[in-house]
């Protein structure tokens, strides 16, 4: 048993069928020695008497919050949440696997830059009595700070006969150095509680490796006379690091017919400007990646043929 | 990446497409490394990152862009000498700093080099021949550091009496071919840098 | 004392389908995942699928996907293995069992797809 | 497809000690704990190891696992006639779980 926070605590229990789990000793955070009486939740059936309470702790109903009493008054209290190891792992009840980049990913995070700036955001089919929080850190051994914001319910949607729901927390690494070599990793540890059920999910990454520039801006293009091609130009997102001499971009450029099965034409460019064939009905599009290190595509900036 | 970027210009910057070709080939090796060590430790998840220039060149702080001068997560100052001239150079009126940020990109050439050659040395003699360095990476090293044209002392590659430890090798290779692409990014975003300025 | 007892094997044709059942007794069924797993005549054990306590994520090996379906009513206790398009190569004594570092094993089933 | 590989047979007279091993890769054993149970003819499997090193309560102490590495083995120290029987080992991989890996089974032999 560990505390979470105060009077909050975490029963570690193996959980399997007939499992004898875990004994607990709870302690009336009181002078008061005689008189004491100890509850359950809403439940006015006496658990036992005396300072301190001891249980056997072994499902969800065995959870919840004890109350010490003395003559109607209450005392202090203790919240029991349980955190289930199934089989040596720990459960992962509470968030949905995105299964993106890979199986097993919880918490998925991206940065628009090198700043040291990165958003996470984890998926969820339950609405109700649920909280998070989040910490984070560079390295674990010797970690350096970075600072969360609270979590966020950033989307819902509807998917099939459920409705997900999408959390967000925006993280700052307090020193950030954008051209500095990362050697330590990002870690992030999210705590979930949903009712009496406990867990915890990490991620440990680079910013390099995170890192999803925000579309091209300004995409704009210009006929070039007496041919069907058109000079496209755009600018870098306003969210790059700079210097862009330093922190390139490179630019893949996209003619797409409306129909989806028509042969897409694709160009890649390092300038800020492409000339094209534009076709009639079609759009042009430009997405943006770190020129050296190949981490995400930026979701496509687009502007129509006509 | 699938397509080719276009060459830089012949007029540019002598450095930069020396460190395009570099960046190239370290991140084949790279990969190639990964596929055909699938059954070591060599993801950028599983490797303890270390860099073996830590202490002996400061490239990152002796290349900051100007624009970055000012913020002082930057400024992790470490003083370290260095040789000052080079062919890279484009004209006389190159500051001092940008005399050892080349100098300082020089240097770690050169360890990456020594490493690489003794490394190559032990995986040659590995009966399984599993994985050898490609010559074209150490090619393009060899370009970059004459083009960088420092005049240094050279390091003698370093001789080992013991039997290698072909496993320890291959894990330590994919250590240096992770930092190394690292550096190699630093190093491009450099040259384009200077490049533009 | 945990207890899961399984039924609904049999003979059947190539092709066709098949229900089998787990009744799970002496334990909160509702609180713990739940795996079926199969074993050819004279071969190795080979998982199947496995549930969530609540039914809400399901698992299947590749060579049953979209062909089996894992359920379970927690108001009846009962886990059920849903068997379609069966094969030769399904024949095997399918077993259920829960989920957890001490597990309990049902006693068995035969199921025989023959022609 | 089975991906932790054990011998398919292992023998041995009453009272030797006699070892099976299971091997596997990084993204299992590597990352994951190991069961080993014991199968009798015409019986479903039982128990015998979980967490690597575990014994439930019921298991005769000459039984006992441990791992290293990519690698688990299951002793049988002092094994006797009702000891003959098929043996699995079980992990997880990591990308896959909560799907149960089997290992391919070894039948150990009581001579004489």
């Known amino acids: 048993i560990w505390e979470l926070k105060k009077d909050v605590y975490v029963v570690e229990l193996d959980w399997y069928p007939d499992a004898p789990g875990e004994m607990v000793v709870l302690t009336c955070d009181t002078p008061e020695e005689d008189g004491i009486t100890w509850t359950l939740d809403q439940s006015s059936e006496v658990l036992g008497s005396g300072k301190t309470l001891t249980i056997q702790v072994k499902e969800f109903g065995d959870a919840g919050q004890y109350t010490c009493h003395k003559g109607g008054e209450v005392l202090s209290h203790s919240l029991l949440l349980l955190h289930k190891k199934e089989d040596g792992i720990w459960s992962t009840d509470i968030l949905k696997d995105q299964k993106e980049p890979k199986n097993k990913t919880f918490l998925r995070c991206e940065a628009k830059n090198y700043s040291g700036r990165f958003t996470c955001w984890w998926l969820t089919t339950i609405s109700t009595d649920l909280t998070f929080s989040v910490k984070s850190s560079r390295g674990s051994s010797d970690p350096q700070g970075v600072t969360c914001g609270a979590a966020t319910l950033s989307a819902e949607r509807v998917r099939g006969d459920n409705k997900e729901y999408e959390y967000s927390v925006e993280c700052q690494e307090d020193s950030a150095c954008p051209a500095a070599e990362e050697s330590l990793p990002i870690e992030v540890m999210v705590d979930a509680v949903h009712k009496l059920k406990y867990e915890n999910y990490t991620s440990s990454f680079f910013i390099r490796d995170i890192i999803k520039p925000d579309p091209p801006k300004n995409l704009q293009l210009k006929p070039l006379k007496n041919s069907r091609q058109v000079e496209v130009s755009w600018e870098y997102p306003d969210t790059w690091s700079t210097p862009h001499s330093y922190f390139s971009l490179t630019f893949c450029v996209q003619v797409q017919g409306k129909s989806k099965r028509e042969k897409k034409d694709r160009v890649f460019t390092d300038k800020t400007s492409a000339t094209v064939i534009c076709r009639k009905n079609a759009s042009i599009s430009v997405r943006a990646q770190d020129r050296y290190y190949s981490s995400s595509w930026s979701e496509w900036a687009s502007v129509p043929c006509s | 990446r699938n397509l080719p970027v276009a060459t830089p210009d012949p007029g540019m910057f002598p450095c930069l497409h020396h460190s395009q070709n570099l960046l190239r080939a370290v991140s084949n090796m790279l990969q190639k490394a990964r596929q055909t060590l699938e059954f070591y430790p060599c993801t950028s998840e599983e490797i303890d990152h270390e860099d073996i220039t830590k202490d002996k060149t400061s490239t990152v702080e002796a290349c900051l862009p100007l624009e970055l001068t000012k913020n002082e997560s930057c400024l992790n100052s470490r003083e370290t000498s260095f040789i000052t001239n080079g062919s890279c150079l484009a004209s006389r009126k190159t500051s001092f700093m940008m005399a050892l940020c080349l100098s300082s990109i020089y240097e770690d050439l050169k360890m990456y080099q020594v490493e690489f050659k003794t490394m190559n040395a032990k995986l040659l003699m590995d009966p399984k021949r599993q994985i050898f360095l490609d010559q074209n990476m150490l090619a393009v090293i060899d370009e970059l550091m004459q083009a960088l044209n420092f005049n240094s002392e050279t390091v003698p590659q370093k001789s080992s009496l013991e039997e290698p430890d072909f496993y320890k090798t291959k894990i330590k290779l994919c250590i240096l071919l992770h930092a190394f692409r690292i550096r190699a990014v630093t190093i491009d975003r450099v040259m384009s840098y200077l490049n533009a300025s | 004392q945990v207890q899961l007892v399984q039924s609904g094997g049999g003979v059947v044709q190539p092709g066709r389908s098949l229900r089998l059942s787990c009744a799970a007794s002496?334990?909160?069924?509702?609180?713990?995942?739940m795996h079926w797993v199969r074993q050819a005549p004279g071969k190795g054990l080979e998982w199947v699928a496995f549930?969530?306590?609540?039914?809400?994520?399901?698992y299947y090996a590749d060579s049953v996907k979209g062909r089996f379906t894992i359920s379970r009513d927690n108001s009846k206790n009962t886990l059920y293995l849903q068997m379609k398009s069966l094969r030769a190569e399904d024949t095997a004594v399918y077993y259920c069992?829960?989920?957890?570092?001490?597990?309990?094993w049902g006693q068995g089933t035969m199921v025989t797809v023959s022609s | 497809s089975y991906v932790l590989t054990q011998p398919p047979s292992v023998s041995g007279t009453p009272g030797q000690r006699v070892t099976i091993s299971c091997s596997g890769g990084r993204s299992n054993i590597g990352s994951n704990r190991v069961k080993w149970y014991q199968q009798l003819p015409g019986t479903a499997p039982k128990l015998l190891i979980y967490g690597n090193d575990q014994r439930p309560s019921g298991v005769p102490d000459r039984f006992s696992g441990s791992k290293s590495g990519t690698s688990a083995s299951l002793a049988i120290t002092g094994v006797q006639a009702e000891d003959e029987a098929d043996y699995y080992c079980q992990s997880y991989d990591r990308g896959t779980h909560p799907a149960l890996l089997f290992g391919t089974g070894t039948k150990v032999t009581v001579l004489g």
């Open positions: 549930i969530r306590y609540d039914g809400s994520n399901k």
């Open positions: 069992k829960t989920h957890g570092s001490h597990d309990n």
């Open positions: 002496g334990f909160t069924f509702s609180s713990y995942g």
